[in-house]
Each structure stands twice: as structure tokens, then as C-alpha cells.
């Protein structure tokens, strides 16, 4: 009997409001045994995969996707999905990334009080 897969969670470090040119890391979490984490844009056809999975806790695994230099094109909704054989999970809730222009005051990142500490990962070929 196939197990019911919990929905993944998604968060962003240092937050969801990022100054233009700064970095952001998306953190996807799921159960132990996830083989592939996928970070999706609004359209499911635009995504980034990783199998570089590590322990978030004794019962959770996580993957991180980093954008080094955020542009306006990176703004928008993101969500996670994962593959744990033999099936894919449901998608996480959407997380909206907002990009602040250089003329605007930097955000106080009020969205990020629950974000875990960064390990400095970097997403490749991300959008």
C-alpha cells in the first residue's frame, strides 16, 4: 500500500521581499526519503530540480535553491513539489517573491521571522 505523502513546505531566506541584485534562497521541505525536490514557477513548465537533499530534522529532509542576484524577472509565485518513489507529492502553497527596486527603501523583511538559518545554497540555471 502506497503511503500518503505530506505536502511540502516552502520558505525563503532572508525573506520574501528582496532588493534588486541581492540573493534569495528558497527552502523546500518534505519527509525523509525524498529523491528529488522541484522548485516551480507559476507555470509548471518552468522548474529547477535538485537531488542534493539533507536532513532538516530526524523526520524531515530539505533542499535549497539559491538565486545569487535577483532581478525583476525573478518576482512572482514559487512552489515546491517532490518525488518520493513511486510518486510525486502535491504542490506546496505558493510563496510570492517581491523584488524591491534600487530607489525604494529596503524592506524590513517582515515576512521572514520564521525562516531557518541559511546554509548558502545556490540554484543553477534558475529562470
Amino acid at each position: 500500500q502506497e503511503e500518503d505523502l505530506p505536502r511540502p513546505s516552502i520558505s525563503a531566506e532572508p525573506g520574501t521581499v528582496i532588493p534588486l541584485g541581492s540573493h534569495v534562497t528558497f527552502v523546500c521541505r518534505g519527509p525523509v526519503g525524498v529523491q528529488t525536490f522541484r522548485l516551480e514557477r507559476e507555470s509548471r513548465s518552468t522548474y529547477n530540480d535538485t537531488e542534493d537533499v539533507s536532513q532538516a530534522s530526524p523526520s524531515e529532509s530539505e533542499a535549497r535553491f539559491r538565486i545569487d542576484s535577483v532581478s525583476e524577472g525573478n518576482a512572482g509565485p514559487y512552489r515546491c513539489i517532490y518525488y518520493k518513489p513511486p510518486k510525486w507529492s502535491e504542490q506546496s502553497d505558493y510563496l510570492e517573491l517581491l523584488v524591491k527596486g534600487p530607489t525604494q527603501r529596503p524592506s524590513d523583511n517582515s515576512h521572514n521571522e520564521h525562516a531557518p538559518a541559511s546554509q548558502g545554497l545556490k540554484a543553477e540555471h534558475l529562470y
Epitope: 535538485t50 537533499v53 530534522s57
Partner: antibody, heavy 119, light 107 residues
Framework: EVQLVETGGGLVQPKGSLKLSCAAS????????MNWVRQAPGKGLEWVAR??????????FYADSVKDRFTISRDDSQSMLYLQMNNLKTDDTAMYYC??????????WGQGTPVTVSA | DIQMTQSPASQSASLGESVTITCLAS??????LGWYRQKPGKSPQLLIY???SLADGVPSRFSGSGSGTKFSFKISSLQAEDFVIYYC?????????FGSGTKLEIK
């Protein structure tokens, strides 16, 4: 088909150096963490080193027994994994395996390359 | 460091029998545990990951159970090729430590 082919092993004197290489094919190398594991003759398995992906700033981790002597590195453009071994000791004599991570577990192993440290 | 205590060190059994190997972690590792087998002169092969999940292509006579600190690995209906060495490994924290191995011998 996933393939991991280790090369570079051989006979080296104590305090000498050796560089092991692992050529990877059959999978998307740059999305996987990679490891080196060794096995001394007639003994059990010992994890040696781990390197994560560009997503993780290529973070590296080492067993205490090799820290400050061994360096793990990777070249994603060539799908290559390396282990630079300096100041070798007789205790480093072992078969060295290149191992691909999947789901955080050691899913695929190379055939190994033997390293003998002896005067 | 997390120590992995694997037992027994060796076990004799007959074809068609079942055997169970246990692994105890010195601290909780959730289900961050793998089981491997190694045939003579060959590389290790992943059999079970995440304590209970069967790796690709592994026969269903192999199974794993447990979480936290106590784990079991069972082979039901032993076949000739099963009489080799088995290792557990924790992947919860570095250094990633292996058990000392269990040699399965034919009775």
C-alpha cells in the same frame, strides 16, 4: 546507466600525495552531492568526505581521520569528482569508492580504486 | 559522533530461512538509515533507504523497519547470493557512520 569510474590509485610512500579521480556519467552530475568512502583490506566501510552542489556553495565535510590532509572537489562541467590526498599514512591503505548521493543516501557506487601506502 | 552498533557480527542460516539484523544508533536519527550489502570483491549496494524504503531493483524479500535509535533489517526466504556482508549506515549527521557489518554464512 549510471557509471562512476575511479582512477588514480596506486602505491605511494608515507607522507606522499595522491589524487583520485571519478568520472561520472548517466545522470545529471551537478544536482547531486558526492562522496568518497573507503574500505581497508578485510575491514568495514568508512565514510571519508562529502561535497554538496553549487546550490550549497560546494560545502565540504570530512571524517576526522582525514581532515586537513584530504581535499574533496568537483568539476561539474566535466562531471568529475576528485580527492586530493596529502601526508598519507599507512592507515590510509584502502579501496576508495566514489559514491553518488540520492535522497541523502549512498545510491550508486563506483568499482573502487586501490591505494596502498607503504615504505 | 553517532555510533552505529550492528549485531550480530556473523550469523549462520539455511537456504529458505529468514534472518534479522539489528542496528542501534547512539542518538536519535529518525529514519535517516540505510542498509547495504557487499558481495566479495564488489562494491556495496544500497538495499534500503530511509529505514524502510526499498531501493530500485531490490527484491521484496528484503525489508527494513524502525526509527529513532533502533532499526531492523530482514531477509525472508534466503537465497544463495544472500550469504554476504551487510552494513547499516546513519546519514543524519556528519561524520556519516557505518555499522561494523554482519557476515551471513550458509549453515
Amino acid at each position: 546507466e549510471v557509471q562512476l569510474v575511479e582512477t588514480g590509485g596506486g602505491l605511494v610512500q608515507p607522507k606522499g600525495s595522491l589524487k583520485l579521480s571519478c568520472a561520472a556519467s548517466g545522470f545529471t552530475f551537478n544536482i547531486n552531492a558526492m562522496n568518497w568512502v573507503r574500505q581497508a583490506p578485510g575491514k568495514g566501510l568508512e565514510w571519508v568526505a562529502r561535497i554538496r552542489t553549487k546550490n550549497n556553495n560546494y560545502a565540504t565535510f570530512y571524517a576526522d581521520s582525514v581532515k586537513d590532509r584530504f581535499t574533496i572537489s568537483r568539476d561539474d562541467s566535466q562531471s568529475m569528482l576528485y580527492l586530493q590526498m596529502n601526508n598519507l599514512k599507512t592507515d590510509d591503505t584502502a579501496m576508495y569508492y566514489c559514491v553518488r548521493d540520492r535522497a541523502g543516501f549512498f545510491a550508486y557506487w563506483g568499482q573502487g580504486t586501490p591505494v596502498t601506502v607503504s615504505a | 559522533d553517532i555510533q552505529m552498533t550492528q549485531s550480530p557480527a556473523s550469523q549462520s542460516a539455511s537456504l529458505g530461512e529468514s534472518v534479522t539484523i539489528t542496528c542501534l544508533a547512539s542518538q536519535t536519527i529518525g529514519t535517516w538509515l540505510g542498509w547495504y550489502r557487499q558481495k566479495p570483491g564488489k562494491s556495496p549496494q544500497l538495499l534500503i533507504y530511509a529505514a524502510t524504503s526499498l531501493a530500485d531493483g531490490v527484491p521484496s524479500r528484503f525489508s527494513g523497519s524502525g526509527s529513532g535509535t533502533k532499526f531492523s533489517f530482514k531477509i525472508s526466504s534466503l537465497q544463495a547470493e544472500d550469504f554476504v556482508i551487510y552494513y547499516c549506515q546513519q546519514l543524519y549527521s556528519t561524520p556519516l557512520t557505518f555499522g561494523s557489518g554482519t557476515k551471513l554464512e550458509i549453515k
